[in-house]
């Protein structure tokens, strides 16, 4: 079931999913000057069986100017430099998260994809928060949020994280410094109240222990 709202906004913090639950959709967006091929997929979809999950469909972008050129292969190194998504070349989840049953890893890039990835999360998805550079995490509880459904309405739990203005950065789970690693899961809430925060974010991702920045919009 799709989450019909967005993860909460925490001042001076960003979030990311370490793995994507089956049912998650990723829009096939192309960078400026390119468009989806006419018969191309609108979305990639995380699907699977009991033993394996993977992304169905392939996103394909073609030049808006030319009609017949179809490209979908991994960008060449010189093309990667043009994009702000270079960290997506390789898996960025810790092994325990990426191999979570019923979850997909970050999809590989497609040529001429937009610099912003738009995901549509499903109920049960978890995202992890970290403070942006220059801010330090103060924890009252887990720095994570889960999409839950109550009375047919979806909402994200509130991450227990405060970011204070000190020159120290926190890390996502599985990265070298475990300072901001979440501890356990949020307690189940049964309230019918729905609180959502909608926003566009800059998300930091780690790729092969190097952190680069790209833009992701979580819907």
């Amino acid at each position: 079931e799709l989450c019909d709202d967005d993860p909460p906004e925490i001042p001076h913090a960003t979030f990311k999913a370490m793995a994507y639950k089956e049912g998650t959709m990723l829009n096939c967006e192309c960078k400026r000057g390119f468009r989806r091929i006419k018969s191309g997929s609108l979305y990639m979809l995380c699907t699977g069986n009991s033993s394996h999950s993977s992304w169905d469909n392939q996103c394909q972008c073609t030049s808006s100017a030319t009609r017949n050129t179809t490209k979908q292969v991994t960008p060449q190194p010189e093309e990667q430099k043009e994009r702000k998504t270079t960290e997506m070349q390789s898996p960025m989840q810790p092994v325990d998260q990426a191999s979570l049953p019923g979850h997909c890893r970050e999809p590989p890039p497609w040529e001429n994809e937009a610099t912003e990835r738009i995901y549509h999360f499903v109920v049960g998805q978890m995202v992890y928060y970290q403070c942006v550079q220059g801010y330090r995490a103060l924890h009252r509880g887990p720095a994570e949020s889960v999409c839950k459904m109550t009375h047919g309405k979806t909402r994200w739990t509130q991450p227990q994280l405060i970011c204070t203005g000190e020159m120290e950065t926190s890390q996502f789970p599985g990265e070298e410094k475990p300072q901001a690693s979440p501890e356990g899961r949020p307690e189940s809430e049964t309230s019918c109240l729905v609180t959502t925060t909608d926003f566009q974010i800059q998300t930091e991702m780690a790729a092969t222990m190097e952190t680069s920045i790209f833009t992701t919009e979580y819907q």
Epitope: E1, D4, G23, M25, Y43, V123, G152, T154, R155, T196
Partner: antibody, heavy 116, light 106 residues
Framework: QVQLVQSGAEVKKPGSSVKVSCKAS????????MHWVRQAPGQGLEWIGY????????EYNQKFKDKATITADESTNTAYMELSSLRSEDTAVYYC?????????WGQGTLVTVSS | DIQMTQSPSTLSASVGDRVTITCSAS?????MHWYQQKPGKAPKLLIY???NLASGVPARFSGSGSGTEFTLTISSLQPDDFATYYC?????????FGQGTKVEVK
Amino acid sequence: QVQLVQSGAEVKKPGSSVKVSCKASGYTFTSYRMHWVRQAPGQGLEWIGYIRPRGGYTEYNQKFKDKATITADESTNTAYMELSSLRSEDTAVYYCARGGGVFDYWGQGTLVTVSS
Amino acid sequence: DIQMTQSPSTLSASVGDRVTITCSASSSISYMHWYQQKPGKAPKLLIYTTSNLASGVPARFSGSGSGTEFTLTISSLQPDDFATYYCHQRSTYPLTFGQGTKVEVK
């Protein structure tokens, strides 16, 4: 109490445009997506798309991508849907519905009639 | 797109009858939701997440099913229940509805 009040019925000429409004009250407008649903005469329900009022992100049913444009005005708690290049087959009742999961609140509907 | 096929399209029944409407999805979905609509009115949420009754909905309504096959049942049809019923999935975009089942007086 939650209310979604839509603008009145419209009669339009083929090729013209129409903008339907949906004014929300009784809840925090920016906390819920606003969806739009179409119902042609004697037909079923078709999802058109939604808007996230804060930020204005929209997601459309591909069928309506070139037909509908959904916008929102946070200052007046109002969502809008503009239909362009109207044809007779666009004659329908258009509903707004509050998102956040199942559609628990709906507008009363706006009948758009396209006729020459 | 996930296609939703309701059957029957029209159902003629009398007050007191047990009525069953089925909805078949072209792909497996997490949950089914059901709406009731009366002429000239907006749809009204009836059942959410397959089997849960929306606020104010009488207990004679029930829902069940999983995967691709779902059912709405009215245990004893009342005069107020003559209406059109729609199934709805929101497991994947685009969101889709069944074509509707009209429950009319026999």
